[in-house]
């Protein structure tokens, strides 16, 4: 049975040009992380493997850093990186959770971090 | 759980439009997840032909981009298939599915054969 | 786009056989391979992720294995109603591709 949850950072806002964290984390469960999938709806960004380390995708590798821990770094954001970002978690025994973060890239100096949530 | 069927004419002519349904049981199209359009073709290969997001947002296959089109009816739980000026190239076994985050594919209807023939 | 290889159309086995079906990427897809299982009459049915990860309620008799460019489905002990065609795909990238499919017959 799957009893862990995937707290990640949310909605979040950052600024043309800038650099953001995305970070998920998997709590509630003994269940070990095999691997992280960093994904959107239409593209792998980078996947973290236990036994094999990082893969960035090609088309990413200019602009996206592996970590802090299981995260991922997206630098010289445009506006075009506006939208949702999935980190699938592959565990054992459990199977796979998934949270879910929105980024939305400003144009404006403004840009303020949402409030964290879960995702069950 | 999930449940997708594909409906269409069966029979189009060449140079014709088809227009495909895949209504979903079971789970709404605007809650989550990309409801996409495969197809088999009669010596089993099989093509993925796009996506419509739970937000509306489309993508195509390169191939098909300019033949093709994903909406959908919301207030029916229903997306669409409309594929322009076929040939007997496109005569195949039409699948909807959903898929999973990651781009895999879990959830399958049965599929609907269309000819194409004069 | 990606070009998936599965170099044997058929292959056949018996009852109880271990078997393993390949597929090939035509570039580095590191893990992001899927494997499919279609009955006769039926639509494909997931059976594998991310190179090896089994889905809800498949059986461990099966399980895959890769990464990179070469990727294995191996069945342990092969049975009657395992006949059916066996296709690979790849999550990497879009447009998202599969393999020609791999016929499994049963002596």
């Known amino acids: 049975m799957m009893t862990g949850t995937i707290e990640t950072t949310g909605n979040i806002s950052a600024e043309k040009g800038g650099s953001i964290i995305l970070q998920c984390h998997l709590s509630s469960t003994t269940a070990q992380v095999t691997q992280v999938n960093w994904e959107q709806q239409d593209q792998l960004l980078a996947i973290c493997n236990a036994d094999l380390g990082w893969h960035i995708s090609p088309s990413f590798k200019d602009r996206v850093a592996p970590g802090p821990g299981l995260g991922l770094t997206l630098q010289s954001l445009t506006v075009n990186d506006t939208g949702e970002y999935f980190c699938i978690y592959h565990t054992y025994p459990d199977g796979t959770y998934t949270g879910r973060i929105f980024l939305e890239v400003l144009e404006s100096s403004v840009a303020e971090h949402g409030a964290r949530f879960q995702i069950p | 759980d999930v449940q997708l069927q594909e409906s269409g004419p069966g029979l189009v002519k060449p140079s014709q439009s088809l227009s495909l349904t895949c209504t979903v049981t079971?789970?709404?199209?605007?809650?989550?997840?990309?409801w996409n359009w495969i197809r088999q073709f009669p010596g089993n290969k099989l093509e993925w032909m796009g996506y419509?997001?739970?937000?509306?947002?489309?993508r195509y296959n390169p191939s098909l981009k300019s033949r093709i089109s994903i909406t959908r009816d919301t207030s029916k739980n229903q997306f669409f298939l409309q594929f322009n000026s076929v040939t007997t190239e496109d005569t195949a076994t039409y699948y909807c599915?959903?898929?999973?985050?990651?781009?895999?594919?879990?959830?399958w209807g049965q599929g609907t054969l269309v000819t194409v023939s004069a | 786009d990606i070009v998936m290889t599965q170099s044997h159309k058929f292959m056949s086995t018996s009852v109880g056989d271990r078997v393993s079906i390949t597929c090939k990427a035509s570039?580095?897809?590191?893990?992001?391979v899927a494997w499919y299982q279609q009955k006769p009459g039926q639509s494909p049915k997931l059976l594998i992720y991310?190179?090896?990860y089994r889905y809800t309620g498949v059986p461990d008799r099966f399980t895959g294995s890769g990464s990179g460019t070469d990727f294995t489905f191996t069945i342990s002990s092969v049975q009657a109603e395992d006949l059916a065609v066996y296709y690979c795909?790849?999550?990497?990238?879009?447009?998202?591709?599969f393999g020609g499919g791999t016929r499994l017959e049963i002596k």
């Open positions: 599915s959903r898929k999973y985050y990651g781009s895999w594919f879990p959830y």
């Open positions: 079971g789970y709404s199209i605007t809650s989550d997840y990309a």
């Open positions: 419509i997001s739970y937000s509306g947002n489309t």
């Open positions: 570039q580095d897809v590191f893990t992001a």
């Open positions: 991310s190179a090896s």
């Open positions: 795909q790849q999550h990497y990238s879009t447009p998202w591709t």
